[in-house]
Amino acid sequence: LQDPCSNCPAGTFCDNNRNQICSPCPPNSFSSAGGQRTCDICRQCKGVFRTRKECSSTSNAECDCTPGFHCLGAGCSMCEQDCKQGQELTKKGCKDCCFGTFNDQKRGICRPWTNCSLDGKSVLVNGTKERDVVCGPSPADLSPGASSVTPPAPAREPGHSPQ
């Protein structure tokens, strides 16, 4: 015999109190698959969390973080504070980037400046806590009689900070 509950679609639950009739999920609850015997309570985005997607009868609410914070953990289970550019968030709070490192975002960790000499280039613009160095032409290109060159783009694309 087929389980009568298997006919209950997403957004409903199989109500044992009503002869296994498929009943709609009550307000603030959902069922994302068919054949469920209960509906799950919708997630509430409160405090530092804000609603990115409202709960429906078939899917849970989705939260993100209010300005000044960013998501951490599966499904944005936690909010982590933003820091300023030129800083990184450690377990003990926002700390300035050490000399020779930079962070051009409000999240992530400080990364070392590009070593221009590894690509045989010179430093065109010095790095700061907020910006990577800009590599210029190689020293050989700057020797007398060399044709003028347009400084190339930075030696590498900025990496993506860990999320």
């Epitope: 951490l72 982590e80 968030l89 450690t90 377990k91 960790i109």
Partner: nanobody, 124 residues
Framework: EVQLLESGGGLVQPGGSLRLSCAAS????????MSWGRQAPGKGLEWVSS????????YYADSVKGRFTISRDNSKNTLYLQMNSLRAEDTAVYYC?????????????????WGQGTTVTVSS
């Protein structure tokens, strides 16, 4: 699959105590440092405490030093947080986290797996 499951949260009066547990599975527990973090209502994540894989080194946030004690039982794959002299400002969801190595790092990015959290409410 790596899993962390916290328990032991609840409602407690100021000055009271609670012991949180975190049951770990899916990895060699003793090989990894572990941490506790918390998120208070309307606030961001705050690191609370960390412990090395062997249990020989422990670290605490200034806000909990002298009141909270982190420990682990590697034979039971379980992490603990003993919380004494609880204050209203300790109210939060507490999360345990696995670190990427046997020693604890300086960053949240050093933690690669988080539990779902257990709620601690300190109120009279």
């Amino acid at each position: 699959e790596v899993q962390l499951l916290e328990s032991g949260g609840g409602l407690v009066q100021p000055g009271g105590s609670l012991r949180l547990s975190c049951a770990a599975s899916g990895f060699t527990f003793s090989s990894y440092a572990m941490s506790w973090g918390r998120q208070a209502p309307g606030k961001g994540l705050e690191w609370v405490s960390s412990i090395s894989g062997s249990g020989g080194s422990t670290y605490y946030a200034d806000s909990v030093k002298g009141r909270f004690t982190i420990s682990r039982d590697n034979s039971k794959n379980t992490l603990y947080l003993q919380m004494n002299s609880l204050r209203a400002e300790d109210t939060a969801v507490y999360y345990c986290a696995k670190e990427k190595t046997g020693t604890t790092g300086d960053y949240y990015y050093d933690m690669d797996v988080w539990g779902q959290g257990t709620t601690v409410t300190v109120s009279s």
